[in-house]
């Protein structure tokens, strides 16, 4: 069956370059036109570039024209996207997509590869408790949590009590701060009556920086 | 370039419902229109091409129609697998423009948020920054307004919000809003409040604390 396997994504500084690859199998590569499409985090699909099956025609979106170059190597069944002078707004998941015969819609897609353009360096998070108090209690239910702040790049994983506590947990999508670093909160609602007896620990793992933090969250002692 | 405009941007529906998504082109594209379905973290999947031709393997409950500048995608009876984001795409011209997407979400019943406020930890204050977090838990619909007030003065530009995906158990959302200040600014003021407005609340709810008090 038709397969498009992508590689080459990663974190890159503004102004630098990156090359994405799209390795094709299951069809005669040299007969098909393949496009690049991207999707910024939380946004819609944006067409990026196309190269015709014979390499004669290349066409680019205005937003990347002059910076990105599409190419192909038929002997390796691979399509490339050379991205130069990268900008933070180029941060996206990039997909290669093959057309159906000659009609320019996308019948087959690669799995996508994330490109993050940022001047931030790899940094592990600081983990701060969101302590339960009378201000975070409502009708016998208390809320508590962890603030996972100032890390780069994505992702971090958060569990509670080493995965034993899952009910009532909300881990929010990360937000990108003006510093270029990410921050997120993970919260859990529990019975107020359990605060004195049950231990609550958030387990934070940031693989890119090899950071693991276990933070005990307890009511503030006044 | 041909612009594609999709509506609505979000559509709340229930299993069994008939739903219709509209796509308009800024100029005629004949029937050179495709529809895609995308689920979180996945690549888009082709549903329909040439406006009304069903892609092989796609269920017949998906119905495409239209030509020229007006197009619709109808799902005759919505199934659990159909909650996703849908995109139209014109392929009449070189720039293969997509619509901005329509998210089909589960229609829930109105539920007011439980509101909680968290002061910055002493640990964080030692680092020179103060984050005050307001949590809105388990509400529906998604539209909610959070306003920060410091000593009753409305804050703007110094907070960020994040919203969870819809919960598959109860169709609700949760939201966190974080007000970030320097330690010096934080210590200049006393009363920190977050005010929440939502359809499920008869009047806005305010949660607050006095800095330094338990």
């Amino acid at each position: 069956q038709v397969q498009l396997v992508q590689s080459g994504g990663g974190v890159v500084q503004p102004g630098r370059s990156l090359r994405l690859s799209c390795a094709a199998s299951g069809f005669t590569f040299s007969r098909y036109t393949i496009h690049w499409v991207r999707q910024a985090p939380g946004k819609g699909l944006e067409w990026v570039a196309v190269m015709s099956y014979n390499g004669n025609n290349k066409h680019y979106a205005d937003s990347v024209n002059g910076r990105f170059t599409i190419s192909r190597n038929d002997s390796k069944n691979t399509l490339y996207l050379n991205m130069n002078s990268l900008r933070p707004e180029d941060t996206a998941v990039y997909y290669c997509a093959r057309i159906r015969d000659t009609a320019m819609f996308f019948a087959h897609w690669g799995q996508g590869t994330l490109v993050t353009v940022s001047s931030a360096s790899t940094k592990g998070p600081s983990v701060f408790p969101l302590a339960p108090s009378s201000k975070s209690t409502s009708g016998g239910t208390a809320a508590l949590g962890c603030l996972v702040k100032d890390y780069f790049p994505e992702p971090v994983t958060v569990s509670w009590n080493s995965g034993a506590l899952t009910s009532g947990v909300h881990t929010f999508p990360a937000v990108l701060q003006s510093s270029g670093l990410y921050s997120l909160s993970s919260v859990v609602t529990v019975p107020s009556s359990s605060l004195g007896t049950q231990t609550y620990i958030c387990n934070v793992n940031h693989k890119p920086s090899n950071t693991k933090v276990d933070k005990k969250v307890e009511p503030k002692s006044c | 370039d041909i612009q594609m405009t999709q509506s609505p941007s979000t559509l709340s529906a229930s299993v069994g419902d008939r739903v219709t998504i509209t796509c308009r082109a800024s100029q005629s594209i004949n029937t050179w229109l495709a529809w895609y379905q995308q689920k979180p973290g996945k690549a888009p999947k082709l549903l329909m091409y040439k406006a009304s031709s069903l892609e092989s393997g796609v269920p017949s409950r998906f119905i495409g129609s239209g030509s020229g500048t007006e197009f619709t995608l109808t799902i005759s009876s919505l199934q659990p697998d159909d909650f996703a984001t849908y995109y139209c795409q014109q392929y009449n011209s070189d720039s293969k423009m997509f619509g901005q997407g329509t998210k089909v979400e589960v229609k829930g019943t109105v539920a007011a948020p439980s509101v909680f406020i968290f002061p910055p930890s002493d640990e964080q204050l030692k680092s020179g920054t103060a984050s005050v977090v307001c949590l809105l838990n388990n509400f529906y619909p998604r539209e909610a307004k959070v306003q920060w007030k410091v000593d009753n003065a409305l804050q703007s530009g110094n907070s960020q919000e994040s919203v969870t995906e819809q919960d598959s158990k109860d169709s609700t959302y949760s939201l966190s809003s974080t007000l970030t200040l320097s330690k010096a600014d934080y210590e200049k003021h006393k009363v920190y409040a977050c005010e929440v407005t939502h359809q499920g609340l008869s009047s806005p709810v305010t949660k607050s604390f006095n800095r330094g008090e338990c």
Epitope: - | V15, Q79, P80
Partner: nanobody, 113 residues
């Protein structure tokens, strides 16, 4: 996830009746509109049968079952029912309930002529 348990299927003579149940594991079930779908042995996809809103005051039926099937719910017991009367051989199918983005596992109904 809300776990949905379909039950009540079986073998019945044409003209007979069956009552299907869809029980949910979670009390949050009551916020959902629930629908019944069916899939015939040769059918490529599941066909809409009936629908009931969260508090039971609105129902909707496929033309093929109108007047014969009745959908109801008991939010105390977290259960939705499909009362099937005057059954026909063409009603033979696996019946599934659905709520939100969740499916039941299906229950087989066979109508013998």
């Amino acid at each position: 996830q809300v776990q949905l348990q379909d039950s009540g299927g079986g073998l019945v003579q044409a003209g007979g009746s069956l009552r299907l149940s869809c029980a949910a594991s979670s009390r949050t079930f009551s916020v959902y509109t629930v629908a019944w779908f069916r899939q015939t042995p040769g059918g490529k996809e599941r066909e809409f049968v009936a629908q009931i809103n969260w508090n039971g005051d609105s129902t909707n039926y496929a033309d093929s079952v109108k007047g014969r099937f009745t959908v109801s719910r008991d939010n105390v017991k977290n259960t939705v029912f499909l009362q099937m009367s005057t059954l026909k051989p063409e009603d033979t199918a696996v019946y599934y309930c659905a709520a939100g983005s969740n499916w039941g596992q299906g229950t087989q109904v066979t109508v013998s002529s």
